[in-house]
Structures are given as structure tokens and as C-alpha cells.
């Protein structure tokens, strides 16, 4: 039975050429989480592995930075970066808990942080 | 701390058998993949079997085909290999390795962690 | 069966200079390549995967490049650790899983 929870950051903005952190975090349950991917629709951005460590997909090496924590860091906005993100967190033995957050890149200034939410 | 220890490796005849066991501690056994890897002395590394975290798909080398099965006790946090038919050339030592990967993430098979290895000697 | 090929088969670097190993697959394995280090009496170590992703603890000196069936290991400036053999291996995703035959970086 998957009793956990994951909060993410939810609908957030952020100024073009700016950079935001994507942030998701399981909680209520004792599950082992053996990896972390991050997925921006149906591309690959980044894995966070128990083993191996983080590996960032080649496409996105220069605007893509690991952490804070299992959170990811994204670099030098432009407005194609606007839509949804995923965390998707494998775990023992529940199985995957997917997170989800909308950002938007903004042209002007008035960028600001959404509230935060929870995704059963 | 993860940790492998490998067991049952020593002399046998050829056409003969022997079972190897890697006792895993560490680390949440369950939805691992797994491998064994062996090393002729003197020579390079080759893998031989992998099985699933669940041990319900298993793979083998072609030069171990028919002769050695690869499987898996969770229950008892450990991996087995038996090896039948044994030949001179199947003379190594052979590692038990955990994979990154899970049923769940999909499998590396790339290899982070190792025991230190147990040596195999096929001779009459 | 896809063949893999390191060379120079041994390769003789003073220490802090730049050790430069290649590998190359019979057939493109993508960027499904990974390299190992091991020293005498020891299991390898995990150095590099996905070609050029450096593994949890691995030192910045280690890097690699390549895809498709040319790739390289660069160790900047090398340590007296480093003395050690390398081995690539390719990881398609079905099997077998081959390695190279070595690289063995000795002192010169």
C-alpha cells in the first residue's frame, strides 16, 4: 500500500534568464527511495541514482545543475522553458510517486513564487 | 555500508560442480539487480549472469549458457551461482556485483559495487 | 556479440602528467559506456558511466568522452593511485554486457 505523499513547490515563475529550483520531497512513509528522475514532458532532464549519483542528460548539461538535494536546478531560463515538470521517485517497496510542477518563464520582472501543494 | 562476500569457490574436476553464494548486507536487497563477473587470472573481465530484484528474468553469457543458472534467495539477502560442467576455461575469480538499478527504475548493468571475489579452479 | 578494443594495451606516464585511453566498440553502443578501474588483489571501482558521467566519489581529474564506438578516459594529472588497469564496457541494453581487454597505465 503506497501511503506516502510528495510536496512539491507547485505552480511557480521565474524571469527569463534567470534560473529556479525544482523542488519535490516524498514524506509518510518508510519506503527506500532508490532513484529520482526528473523529466520536463516527455524528455529527460536528470537522474539522482542511490548508487551512482546524479547524471545530468547530455542536452542539458549547461543549463541544468543537480540539488539542492534531490531538487534540480534550472539555469539560464528562456520561455520555451515554460510548462510541466515531473519528479518521479522510484522507492522500495511502495513502488513510484510522481510529482508535479508547473513553471513559467516570464519576459518581465514580475516573477514570483506560487504557493506549494501537495500530490497524494 | 554496502557488502558483498562471495563463497564456495576452490578445486574441481572437469565436468564438475560447484555452487557460489554472495551474502549481500547494507543495503535493501530485494529490488537489486544482480550480477556475477569473472576474471581468468592474468586476463580481463568478463560478466556471465544477471537476474531481476524479483529473480523472475535471468540472463547469461553464451559461453556459460546451459551449464551455469544464476539465482536468488531474498529472503536470505543472497545471490547464487551454480555451475555445472565445469571446464578448465571457466577458471576465474568471480565477483558478485550489485546493479544501480531496480523493476522499478529498469536495470543498469553497470557496477558500483563488488564483493572481493571468490577464486575457481577447474583441474584434474 | 559486440567487441570492445582499448588501447594502447599499456600506456607509461610520469606522475601529474595526462593519461589519455581510448576504447572502441565493434558496433555504435551509444553512450552505454562505462569504465572501471582495478588494482592488483582488488574488485573494480566504478569510474565513469554514460560515457562521461563521473560516479558518486570519483575525483575530477577522471573524465570521459566519446559516443557511438569511439570513447576516451582522461586522467588530468596523474596520482600515484592512479597506476592502476582500465577497462571499458559497454552496456547496450541486452546482452552480453563486454568489456575491453585493459588498459594497464604504469610509472614511466
Known amino acids: 500500500m503506497m501511503t506516502g505523499t510528495i510536496e512539491t513547490t507547485g505552480n511557480i515563475s521565474a524571469e527569463k534568464g534567470g534560473s529556479i529550483i525544482l523542488q519535490c520531497h516524498l514524506s509518510s512513509t518508510t519506503a527506500q527511495v532508490t532513484q529520482v528522475n526528473w523529466e520536463q514532458q516527455d524528455q529527460l532532464l536528470a537522474i539522482c541514482n542511490a548508487d551512482l549519483g546524479w547524471h545530468i542528460s547530455p542536452s542539458f548539461k549547461d543549463r541544468v545543475a543537480p540539488g539542492p538535494g534531490l531538487g534540480l536546478t534550472l539555469q539560464s531560463l528562456t520561455v520555451n522553458d515554460t510548462g510541466e515538470y515531473f519528479c518521479i521517485y522510484h522507492t522500495y517497496p511502495d513502488g513510484t510517486y510522481t510529482g508535479r510542477i508547473f513553471l513559467e518563464v516570464l519576459e518581465s520582472s514580475v516573477a514570483e513564487h506560487g504557493a506549494r501543494f501537495q500530490i497524494p | 555500508e554496502v557488502q558483498l562476500l562471495e563463497s564456495g569457490g576452490g578445486l574441481v574436476q572437469p565436468g564438475g560442480s560447484l555452487r557460489l553464494s554472495c551474502a549481500a548486507s547494507?543495503?535493501?536487497?530485494?529490488?537489486?539487480?544482480m550480477s556475477w563477473v569473472r576474471q581468468a587470472p592474468g586476463k580481463g573481465l568478463e560478466w556471465v549472469s544477471a537476474?531481476?530484484?524479483?529473480?523472475?528474468?535471468?540472463w547469461h553469457a553464451d559461453s556459460v549458457k546451459g551449464r551455469f543458472t544464476i539465482s536468488r534467495d531474498n529472503s536470505k539477502n543472497t545471490l547464487y551461482l551454480q555451475m555445472n560442467s565445469l571446464r578448465a576455461e571457466d577458471t576465474a575469480v568471480y565477483y558478485c556485483a550489485k546493479d544501480p538499478g531496480t523493476d522499478s527504475t529498469g536495470y543498469y548493468y553497470i557496477w558500483r559495487y563488488w564483493g572481493q571475489g571468490t577464486l575457481v579452479t577447474v583441474s584434474s | 556479440e559486440i567487441v570492445m578494443t582499448q588501447s594502447p594495451a599499456t600506456l607509461s606516464v610520469s606522475p601529474g602528467e595526462r593519461a589519455t585511453l581510448s576504447c572502441r566498440a565493434s558496433?555504435?553502443?551509444?553512450?552505454?559506456l562505462a569504465w572501471y578501474q582495478q588494482k592488483p588483489g582488488q574488485a573494480p571501482r566504478l569510474l565513469i558511466y554514460s560515457a562521461s558521467t563521473r560516479a558518486t566519489g570519483i575525483p575530477a581529474r577522471f573524465s570521459g568522452s566519446g559516443s557511438g564506438t569511439e570513447f576516451t578516459l582522461t586522467i588530468s594529472s596523474l596520482q600515484s593511485e592512479d597506476f592502476a588497469v582500465y577497462y571499458c564496457?559497454?552496456?547496450?541494453?541486452?546482452?552480453?554486457?563486454?568489456f575491453g581487454g585493459g588498459t594497464k597505465v604504469e610509472i614511466k
Open positions: 537476474i531481476s530484484g524479483s529473480g523472475a528474468s535471468t
Open positions: 547494507g543495503f535493501t536487497f530485494g529490488p537489486y539487480g
Open positions: 558496433q555504435s553502443v551509444s553512450s552505454n
Open positions: 564496457q559497454q552496456y547496450v541494453p541486452h546482452p552480453p554486457f563486454t
